[in-house]
């Protein structure tokens, strides 16, 4: 049987001779050289050589446990004469024995980590890990201990775990943001003679909201013309916040001041500025200066930092309203005036009033826009705005006159405004009624008395308030002995009636009836119109068959009292 134990070999042998491993020996070996030892397997003949006579094994090269900790070889013992094995082939192990020849190596050359600023002492930052290739099962060659070489007093490292923690209270990002920490990993449990490796940990403090917004100045002043429409931006203010990102976001608001209702503040999300805008129409004449208290605040606040004070700041904004010269303003948007048509020249119709709305109350002068009164029918007193006639009027020609009056600042003629004037001409009874049309009628020779042969209508250019009331009668010169009568219907119409039975066209073929038409207004106006009545031959139905074809007279009405 074979006689050996497991072989152990120290790694990293540095001697000048081959390193002795051990001896293969069979109890069949009598020491007479009859046996031959043969080695095969891992590294046989190369790494490991055997003296075939003695069975001594040697290592020819320096071995590294971390490269290969175990070699499995096979041993044979052969009778030289017969060539037959004297022992069964057997497997054996050469175990490489560890020495501390490897330093700990970190998993990363450089670690990056973040931790919120102002964290409590002992807050976890990052865990670093170093590995040691030496044998962890034997001795302390692979027992790693962590320590901090650079980064105190800000950070600490747990020696066994490599966990890095904060070590200083109130680390402020706004004071210092970046830290470079150097961590050492040392084997041999950190004892003298242990091997070590280092890594760099770049730690960035992340922002927390520990700073309030601050206005760089306590007072701001802006100017804006009184004509600025609502929504007009008039100035920008900006508070600064030492924090970043969401923690530096600022909201602006107006918290106090006389301008609370007149102005707004809008937060510009891009620039983080507060834009002061006009909210309501301004008026220099009402108020010239406004003060506002504007507040800048963080919308997101961390309650644990409230002890540092309120996360807001305020500034005074003074807004100066600039005067804009405004045109005069009329007391009405339009004026409606009335005047009788019989008014004499220079009759005053009414007046207009305009005033400079500016605080200076500049005087104004008045004029008529002649493009609206080409015939110069009206005029205006440039000083007091009185409107008067400069020509005679006629309602029947034009009922309404639409003119424009201009008010101009005397000190600044560029500032002017206009107003429409609607002048109504009131009716006066200055026109007589007339026949509505030219009346030519006929009567049958065989007509009976009191027959209606024509209804008369009248018109009057006037427009009396109570309506027209016309009366009709035969002219006095024709009233006695007339062959016809006029019947006033009392409804502004009249009828011509026959007064006798039968007419002879050979005796009188045409009658001219002068009719007087009067109105009922003051002063009474009347006119005389003539109605032509022709005598005609008629059939038994009363249909006209023939009349004398005389030239007809178209008489003009005679007017009296005009």
């Amino acid at each position: 049987s074979w006689m050996w134990n497991q072989f152990f070999l120290l790694e990293e042998y540095t001697g000048s001779d081959y390193q002795y491993v051990g001896k293969l020996h069979s109890d069949q070996d009598r020491g007479d050289g009859s046996l031959k030892y043969i080695l095969s397997g891992d590294g046989a003949g190369d790494l490991f050589i055997i003296n075939e006579n003695t069975g001594d094994i040697q290592a020819t090269k320096r071995l590294d446990r971390e490269e290969k900790p175990v070699y499995i070889l096979r041993a044979q013992a052969i009778n030289r004469r017969t060539g037959r094995p004297v022992e069964p082939e057997s497997e054996f192990i050469i175990k490489i024995h560890d020495i501390n020849d490897n330093e700990p190596i970190f998993t990363k050359e450089v670690y990056t980590a973040t931790v919120p600023e102002m964290s409590d002492v002992g807050t976890f930052v990052v865990q670093v890990t170093a590995t040691d290739a030496d044998d962890p099962t034997y001795g302390n060659s692979a027992k790693v201990v962590y320590s901090i070489l650079q980064g105190q007093p800000y950070f600490s490292v747990e020696s066994e775990t490599g966990i890095i923690k904060t070590a200083l209270l109130n680390m402020d990002r706004e004071n210092r943001e970046q830290y470079q920490v150097v961590i050492q990993a040392k084997d041999m449990g950190g004892q003298m003679g242990g091997l070590s490796g280092t890594t760099t940990v770049n730690i960035t403090l992340t922002d927390v909201n520990d700073n309030p917004p601050r206005f760089p100045q306590s007072t701001y002043q802006f100017k804006t013309p009184e004509s600025s429409p609502p929504g007009t931006p008039i100035g920008r203010i900006k508070a600064s916040d030492a924090d970043v990102g969401e923690n530096a976001e600022i909201e602006y608001s107006i918290t106090d001041g006389e301008g609370l209702d007149m102005f707004d503040v809008i937060t510009d999300q891009e620039t983080q500025e507060g834009i002061i805008t006009v909210k309501k129409l301004l008026d220099f004449e009402k108020k010239k200066v406004y003060t506002l208290k504007v507040e800048a605040s963080n919308p997101y606040v961390e309650p644990r930092f409230l002890y540092l004070g309120p996360f807001k700041d305020s500034a005074t904004v003074r807004i100066v309203v600039e005067d804009v010269d405004e045109p005069p303003v009329f007391s009405k948007l339009a004026y409606i005036l009335q005047i009788r048509e019989d008014a004499q020249i220079n009759t005053t119709i009414g007046s207009v009033t305009a005033q400079d709305p500016d605080a200076a109350r500049n005087p104004v002068k008045y004029s008529v826009d002649r493009h609206t009164d080409m015939d110069r029918i009206f005029n205006i007193d440039s000083g007091n705005g009185s409107i008067f006639t400069s020509k005679l009027l006629d309602r029947e020609t034009l009922l309404w006159h639409n003119i424009t009056v201009i008010a101009t600042e005397i000190n600044n003629p560029k500032q002017s405004s206009r107003v429409p004037l609607y002048i109504k001409v009131l009716d006066v009874n200055d026109n007589a009624p007339e026949f509505a049309e030219f009346y030519e009628t006929f009567v049958c020779e065989k007509a009976k008395a009191d027959q209606l042969i024509q209804t008369l209508h009248a018109v009057d250019k006037d427009d009396p308030y109570s309506g027209h009331q016309f009366s009709f009668s035969l002219a006095p010169e024709a009233a006695s002995g007339s062959n016809f009568t006029i019947q006033d219907n009392k409804d502004n119409t009249a009828g011509i009636l026959t007064r006798k039975n039968g007419y002879n066209r050979h005796e009188m073929s045409t009658y001219l009836l002068p009719v007087v038409i009067s109105d009922n207004d003051y002063p009474v106006q009347s006119s005389t119109g003539t109605v032509t009545v022709r005598v005609c031959a008629c059939d038994h139905h009363g249909n006209m068959q023939s009349c004398h074809a005389e030239a007809l007279i178209h008489p003009t009405g005679l007017s009296t009292g005009a």
Partner: antibody
Framework: EVQLVQSGAEVKKPGASVKVSCKAS????????MHWVRQAPGQGLEWMGW????????EYASKFQGRVTITADTSTSTAYMELSSLRSEDTAVYYC???????????????WGQGTLVTVSS | DIQMTQSPSSLSASVGDRVTITCKAS??????LAWYQQKPGKAPKLLIY???TLQTGVPSRFSGSGSGSDFTLTISSLQPEDFATYFC????????FGQGTKVEIK
């Protein structure tokens, strides 16, 4: 030429009131802001308030609020400054000064009155 | 409120000297600053406005500079009539004067 002529010196007892006048000429009185500034003996200048004579609007320094009243009479182009509840520390020369801008409450003072000495003494 | 600080409070100089007076505002007032000259028993007189614009009729030896919160009045060559007290005034927001600088004969 613009001129601001102030009323003469006054001696007042503590607790009394004083009214100083300032007559303007050489410009449109209603179109410029009129300011009042005082100067205690050997001291600096102190702004008190303004009036816009065009419509009588005023603004006062917070220090004088409730104690000062500035008025204007446009018919005589005269501004007035009345200070009440006088105390010894109100002894000063009181100046009226024209604001350079007509159309806005701001700016420097381009013309000054000659000053009125008000002495407050018991 | 904005405070104005003038320095020096007084200085002694001779005719022909170059004199510099400074004025510091407690906050940014841009160029809204005027300089006035006051002689004993007289009203202040406007010299410079908008920090560096010379008022009509004021000699060119007076000049102003600055913007923001730091301003300077310079008299390039002091004349006998220039011995007086000088005030700065801000009109950016409301009105406030410096305490004055008295320029005396050396």
């Amino acid at each position: 030429e613009v001129q601001l002529v102030q009323s003469g010196a006054e001696v007042k007892k503590p607790g009394a009131s004083v009214k100083v006048s300032c007559k303007a000429s050489g410009y449109t009185f209603t179109r410029n802001f009129m300011h009042w500034v005082r100067q205690a003996p050997g001291q600096g200048l102190e702004w008190m308030g303004w009036i816009y004579p065009g419509d009588g609007e005023t603004e006062y320094a917070s220090k004088f609020q409730g104690r000062v009243t500035i008025t204007a009479d446009t018919s005589t182009s005269t501004a007035y400054m009345e200070l009440s509840s006088l105390r010894s520390e109100d002894t000063a020369v009181y100046y009226c000064a024209r604001g350079v801008y007509g159309g806005a409450a701001g700016g420097y003072f381009d013309f000054w009155g000659q000053g009125t000495l008000v002495t407050v003494s018991s | 409120d904005i405070q104005m600080t003038q320095s020096p409070s007084s200085l002694s100089a001779s005719v022909g000297d170059r004199v510099t007076i400074t004025c510091k505002a407690s906050q940014n007032i841009y160029k809204n600053l005027a300089w006035y000259q006051q002689k004993p028993g007289k009203a202040p007189k406007l010299l410079i406005y908008d920090a560096n614009t010379l008022q009509t009729g004021v000699p060119s030896r007076f000049s102003g500079s600055g913007s923001g919160s730091d301003f300077t009045l310079t008299i390039s060559s002091l004349q006998p009539e220039d011995f007086a007290t000088y005030f700065c005034q801000q009109y950016y927001s409301g009105w406030a004067f410096g305490q004055g600088t008295k320029v005396e004969i050396k």
